[in-house]
């Protein structure tokens, strides 16, 4: 595939990545799938600056990111190492709370109203952010 050198229409460029901010809500798995279909992934936060950038664009609204522990340990969707990476959980989080009555615990991470992270039920219809890196190989075939 060809290398992507600029962001698609309606995406925002920042530090060699492109971001797309939803204005509707989806369950985490549906949001994850949406990003994949766009040759992207749910946002992976790797620094203070990226946290602040995303926060600036989403405002005080619950918004999914590409972090989950549906298979046990917390994992970023692009393979970024969770243990050594940037974290910004709210106090007392993640807590895998079972008291919501929706079955199971809480396996998906989202930005809260103050920007810090919380784990929640993956079925909740929150907004989401897609991210794709510039200069990575696109899945689209090159134009002839």
């Amino acid at each position: 595939g060809s290398e992507r050198t600029c962001c698609p229409v309606n995406w925002v460029e920042h530090e060699r990545s492109c971001y797309w901010f939803s204005r509707s809500g989806k369950a985490w798995a549906d949001a994850d799938n949406y990003c994949r279909l766009e040759d992207a992934h749910l946002v992976v936060v790797t620094s203070w600056e990226e946290q602040k950038f995303v926060q600036h664009h989403i405002g005080p609204v619950n918004t999914w990111m590409g972090l989950h522990d549906q298979n046990g340990p917390w994992k970023w969707v692009d393979g970024t190492d969770y243990e050594t990476g940037f974290k910004n959980w709210r106090p007392e989080q993640p807590d895998d709370w079972y008291g919501h009555g929706l079955g199971g615990g809480e396996d998906c991470a989202h930005f809260t109203d103050d920007g810090r992270w919380n784990d929640d039920v993956c079925q909740r219809p929150y907004r989401w952010v897609c991210e794709t890196e510039l200069d990575k190989a696109s899945q689209e075939p090159p134009l002839l």
Partner: antibody, heavy 119, light 107 residues
């Protein structure tokens, strides 16, 4: 009401160490990040360091990196600044400030403690 | 590191005057710009966070605006208690940095 009280300042010789403390009350200390900011006599404000509410992340100004260590004891509601290899240019009033979670601004400040580095 | 340039460094003005202080960042900081007031011998006090959010208890004559690299603090009608030094600070990227300050003095 939110109260922050710094202590531990004093006169110290260049190359020596000092530990500052900031005692917090009037809020849930363990839920907030905290900053150290300093001000040399007659000069402007100079950010020193920040620590997350649980100590998981710490950031420093270039001028103190490798010499100063920010830490906290949530069981004692106390913030610390360990200052090693002190220099004359570290002479300042040192303030602690509470971090506003959304903006990272210092929303409440202590009254400061004076550190003088002199031989 | 992000440099914050404040201007003017000092100004002499009178009670009732409109005062404007500017702060420029060396790169975009979005809206992560905050304004503090400091009186002699006292700790700084947060006036405005996130470029334009007035802190609780701060008089409405203070206002902030701007985004990206250019920001402004305005005092619509200066009062006697407003004579002080004002600082801007960015919290977009560590190390967090302050402007050099603007001293507002009585003419």
């Amino acid at each position: 009401q939110v109260q922050l009280v710094e202590s531990g300042g004093g006169v110290v010789q260049p190359g020596r160490s000092l530990r500052l403390s900031c005692a917090a009350s009037g809020f849930t200390f363990s839920s907030y990040g905290m900053h150290w900011v300093r001000q040399a006599p007659g000069k402007g404000l100079d950010w020193v360091a920040v620590i997350w509410y649980d100590g998981s992340n710490k950031y420093y100004a270039d001028s103190v990196k490798g010499r100063f260590t920010i830490s906290r004891d949530n069981s004692k509601n106390t913030l610390y600044l360990q200052m090693n290899s002190l220099r004359a240019e570290d002479t300042a009033v040192y303030y602690c400030a509470r971090d506003d979670p959304r903006s990272s601004a210092g929303d409440y400040w202590g009254q400061g403690t004076l550190v003088t580095v002199s031989s | 590191d992000i440099q914050m340039t404040q201007s003017p460094s000092s100004l002499s003005t009178s009670v009732g005057d409109r005062v404007t202080i500017t702060c420029r960042a060396s790169q975009s900081i979005f809206s992560y710009l905050h304004w503090y007031q400091q009186k002699p011998g006292k700790a700084p006090k947060l006036l405005i966070s996130a470029a334009s959010s007035l802190q609780s208890g701060v008089p409405s004559r203070f206002s902030g605006s701007g985004s990206g690299t250019d920001f402004t603090l305005t005092i619509s009608s200066l009062q006697p208690e407003d004579f002080a030094t004002f600082y801007c600070q960015q919290t977009y990227s560590p190390p967090l940095t302050f402007g050099g300050g603007t001293k507002v003095e009585i003419k």
